[in-house]
């Protein structure tokens, strides 16, 4: 089989601070040295890019400075964290993995992680 399998959790609940973390694991058919990981958000059949990072195997995952994502890599596993989430960001977050180099190129698309975000209740004023 030439397809690359990508696994990610079905559901994740964001913290009260709007932070969600999940693991994206891929079964590499080859020995890739350069990997690109992209987080996509799917809502109403529209797909948008949340963040992306390219890394060399054995090196750290580096997202752009203004990215809402951070992550670490270990072998064929990527630990992703998305920050600054609000209730309106609740949705399906898909992990996309591309083995860029060396040939052949492989594409792997996860089934998506449903991230639920609940905005924290504002603290009531204290009466003393």
């Amino acid at each position: 089989c030439k397809a690359m399998h990508v696994a990610q959790p079905a559901v994740v609940l964001a913290s009260s601070r709007g932070i969600a973390s999940f693991v994206c694991e891929y079964a590499s058919p080859g020995k890739a040295t350069e990997v690109r990981v992209t987080v996509l958000r799917q809502a109403d059949s529209q797909v948008t890019e949340v963040c992306a990072a390219t890394y060399m195997m054995g090196n750290e995952l580096t997202f752009l400075d203004d990215s809402i994502c951070t992550g670490t890599s270990s072998g064929n596993q990527v630990n992703l964290t998305i920050q600054g989430l609000r209730a309106m960001d609740t949705g399906l977050y898909i992990c996309k993995v591309e083995l860029m180099y060396p040939p052949p190129y492989y594409l792997g698309i996860g089934n998506g992680t449903q991230i639920y975000v609940i905005d924290p209740e504002p603290c009531p004023d204290s009466d003393f």
Partner: antibody
Framework: EVQLVESGGGLVKPGGSLRLSCAAS????????MHWVRQAPGKGLEWVSF????????YYADSVKGRFTISRDNAKNSLYLQMNSLRAEDTAVYYC???????????WGQGTMVTVSS | EIVLTQSPATLSVSPGERATLSCRAS???????LAWYQQKPGQAPRLLIY???SRATGIPDRFSGSGSGTDFTLTISRLEPEDFAVYYC?????????FGQGTKVEIK
């Protein structure tokens, strides 16, 4: 408007060279991989070449390897295909296509005709 | 290289009827990585189906895709006059990216 527009096609003699361009607009060009696909007269679609987001990774069909070079300029939202040592069998309509976020080629240009003949 | 074989080469159907197109892969293709395109004379291909069964934006629901592994199907439930065209399947899960040879759907 989200679109791709190819240019640079024409008539060239065998052994000659041609450079195709593809101008992208209406989307963040650097967030997508890009491809060239060709179609010989009356024939099916044949993938020609791929280029990664930053242009560092390139792949080619065996039929064009060593003769064609793909490149991109993200600052100019442009994709290119440099075609050298052209042969009669390279005669085709050449399309640039966007590798969609989920992988399929979700946006195509209108195509540019390349004819290799003496 | 994954070779995609489409059948039949030509399908003659009357408007309003159902059309069933087949695409067989030489080795297993993950269902997430199989697409169908429509091409009309003088036009560029247009994405219809991706991920074997998901309709692309703006594609009417008379088009549906199914299948997994090595066997995939594109079904057009009720052919409209504008549906007569050539249809290609494609795998995009690994390089080289490959297309089937196409199925021409013509008016009977």
């Amino acid at each position: 408007e989200v679109q791709l527009v190819e240019s640079g096609g024409g008539l060239v003699k065998p052994g000659g060279s041609l450079r195709l361009s593809c101008a992208a607009s209406g989307f963040t060009f650097s967030s997508y991989t890009m491809h060239w696909v060709r179609q010989a007269p009356g024939k099916g679609l044949e993938w020609v070449s791929f280029i990664s987001y930053d242009g560092n990774t390139k792949y080619y069909a065996d039929s064009v390897k060593g003769r064609f070079t793909i490149s991109r300029d993200n600052a100019k939202n442009s994709l290119y295909l440099q075609m050298n040592s052209l042969r009669a069998e390279d005669t085709a309509v050449y399309y640039c296509a966007r590798g969609g976020l989920l992988g399929p080629f979700d946006l195509w240009g209108q195509g540019t005709m390349v004819t290799v003949s003496s | 290289e994954i070779v995609l074989t489409q059948s039949p080469a030509t399908l003659s159907v009357s408007p309003g009827e159902r059309a069933t197109l087949s695409c067989r892969a030489s080795q297993s293709v993950g269902s997430s990585y199989l697409a169908w395109y429509q091409q009309k004379p003088g036009q560029a291909p247009r994405l219809l189906i991706y991920g074997a069964s998901s309709r692309a934006t703006g594609i009417p629901d008379r088009f549906s895709g199914s299948g997994s592994g090595t066997d995939f199907t594109l079904t057009i439930s009720r052919l409209e006059p504008e549906d007569f065209a050539v249809y290609y399947c494609q795998q995009y899960g690994s390089s080289p990216w490959t297309f089937g040879q196409g199925t021409k759907v013509e008016i009977k």
